[in-house]
């Protein structure tokens, strides 16, 4: 008699999901010196702890932390890049400012991007078939814990001047209900962070607006204030030649405003 | 240092602004709040300005102040005092770092609005 | 609009002794700790002491110290002295900025 399977409503494991962590791990170790050190079979072994034989709904960050534990790294704190709604383009830029970092391109942030898992309660095994979505069945589930767990590590470890990408062809440019806006905001360290600096990204060639002055920016600029952080905000007009000219900066167009 | 400049008798309705101006830092840097003291009396918060040029006010003081900055000094305008607004009125800057703490204040400015 | 209350005012400590002030808010302040303190003596503005509910601030001694969260905030000073002569103020950040007020201060007498 086939066992009775959960459905649930958001798309199920990635295909091959084990063999791309575990390759992405080697990969990421081979290519950055500092996390030679680093077991990834034991990293695949914490990684499917997490969330092997738990109800989908039910995952906890304490279920992700001998993940956190063998993927710590130290990434220079006053060198970090978040982003909300506009990935592509923060990872362009870290790409070219090889000094500055996303999540993703941290060790745990690395292996999981773009990537779906969940199993299920009381077997072994990985649901290739569906995984909980978010919004239509529970937020509790073991992608969406993970990413809160990372996004808020990763917050809470920067310092100094911290910047965000967001997204400006988007209704609401920030978004509360991001991971940026309900996660990372909240968990910045006053302590440590001297100004959150916004890049709103412009997607029309002929926009000329200051999207700097949108009610949503207004509100992130009082959530982070309130937080005893200083805000600060520019317009990148031209995402094409603000790239180019992290490549270039001695080329003579990129004294104009971007 | 801070200082607050401005303060003076006024008649009842007479529109009045105070100016806050910073030596050994630029002011349009730094997020400045605005507090009064009436004689004997308790500290009010009044508003802040942000760096951006935002400003938010305390319930009671929307629409009888207006805050507004130039490139070196922070304003405060009384649109139309009356004698409850009789008062020291200080300026604070969240001077070095800081948003909404005081670390830097002025002398204070003496506001009269008397008939 | 958010009440904060002070308590107790005045206050009499002796040299040496322990002063405490409470501050209670009538609703939460941001993060549960976006409360600061403040010293004030006759004709001069007032001084910061305490930040974000418990950091001191640059200066100042460390016999100044404050503590609690959300709704409930205490300035604890130990050993006083006499230079401790003062009116003390918390200073309430909300979520709505309408809502942002100080206390009505605290008269500390020293003995």
């Known amino acids: 008699v086939p066992r009775w399977r959960q459905q649930w409503s958001g798309p199920g494991t990635t295909k091959r999901f084990p063999e791309t962590v575990l390759a992405r791990c080697v990969k990421y170790t081979e290519i950055h010196p500092e996390m030679r050190h680093v077991d990834c079979q034991s990293v695949w072994d914490a990684f499917k702890g997490a969330f092997i034989s738990k109800h989908p709904c039910n995952i906890t960050e304490e279920d992700y932390q001998p993940l956190m534990k063998l993927g710590t790294q130290t990434v220079p704190c006053n060198k970090i890049l978040l982003w909300s709604r506009i990935k592509d383009l923060a990872h362009q830029f870290t790409q070219v400012q090889r000094d500055m970092f996303t999540l993703e391109d941290t060790l745990l942030g690395y292996l999981a991007d773009d990537l779906t898992w969940c199993g299920e309660f009381n077997t072994s095994k990985i649901n290739y078939q569906s995984c909980p979505d978010w919004r239509k069945d529970c937020s509790n589930n073991p992608v969406s814990v993970f990413w809160k767990t990372v996004s808020r590590r990763f917050a809470e470890a920067a310092c100094d001047v911290v910047h965000v990408m967001l997204n400006g062809s988007r209704s609401k440019i920030f978004d509360k209900n991001s991971t940026f806006g309900s996660v990372e905001v909240h968990n910045l360290q006053p302590e440590k962070v001297q100004t959150l600096e916004a890049w709103v990204i412009h997607g029309g060639r002929e926009d000329s607006r200051d999207l700097c002055q949108d009610p949503t920016i207004k509100e992130l600029e009082s959530i982070i204030s309130k937080r005893n952080i200083q805000f600060s905000c520019k317009n990148i007009y031209r995402p094409d030649k603000f790239l180019q000219c992290v490549k270039n900066p001695e080329d003579s167009s990129c004294t104009s405003e971007i | 240092s801070v200082e607050e400049s401005g303060g003076r008798l006024v008649t009842p309705g007479t529109p009045l602004t105070l100016t806050c101006t910073a030596s050994?830092?630029?002011?349009?840097?730094?997020?400045v709040t605005w507090v009064r003291q009436a004689p004997g009396k308790g500290l009010e918060w009044i508003g802040i300005i942000y760096i951006s040029g935002t400003t938010y006010y305390a319930t009671w003081a929307k629409g009888r102040f207006t805050i507004s900055k130039s490139a070196t000094t922070v304003d405060l305008r009384i649109a139309s005092p009356t004698t409850e607004d009789t008062a020291t009125y200080f300026c604070?800057?969240?001077?070095?770092?800081?948003?909404?703490?005081?670390?830097?204040w002025g002398p204070g400015t003496l506001v009269t609005v008397s008939s | 609009a958010a009440v904060l209350t002070q308590t107790p005012s005045p206050v009499s400590a002796a040299v040496g002794g322990t002063v405490t002030i409470k501050c209670q808010s009538s609703?939460?302040?941001?993060?549960?700790?976006?409360l600061s303190w403040y010293q004030q003596k006759p004709g001069q503005p007032p001084k910061l002491l305490i930040y974000l509910a418990s950091t001191l601030a640059s200066g100042v001694p460390s016999r100044f110290s404050g503590s609690g969260s959300g709704t409930q905030f205490t300035l604890t000073i130990s050993s006083v002295q006499s230079d401790d002569a003062a009116t003390y103020y918390c200073?309430?950040?909300?979520?709505?900025?309408?809502?942002?007020?100080f206390g009505g201060g605290t008269e500390v007498v020293v003995k």
């Open positions: 609703q939460s302040v941001v993060n549960a700790n976006n």
């Open positions: 200073l309430g950040v909300y979520d709505d900025d309408g809502d942002n007020a």
């Open positions: 050994g830092f630029s002011l349009s840097r730094y997020y």
């Open positions: 604070a800057a969240a001077w070095p770092v800081g948003t909404y703490v005081l670390p830097l």
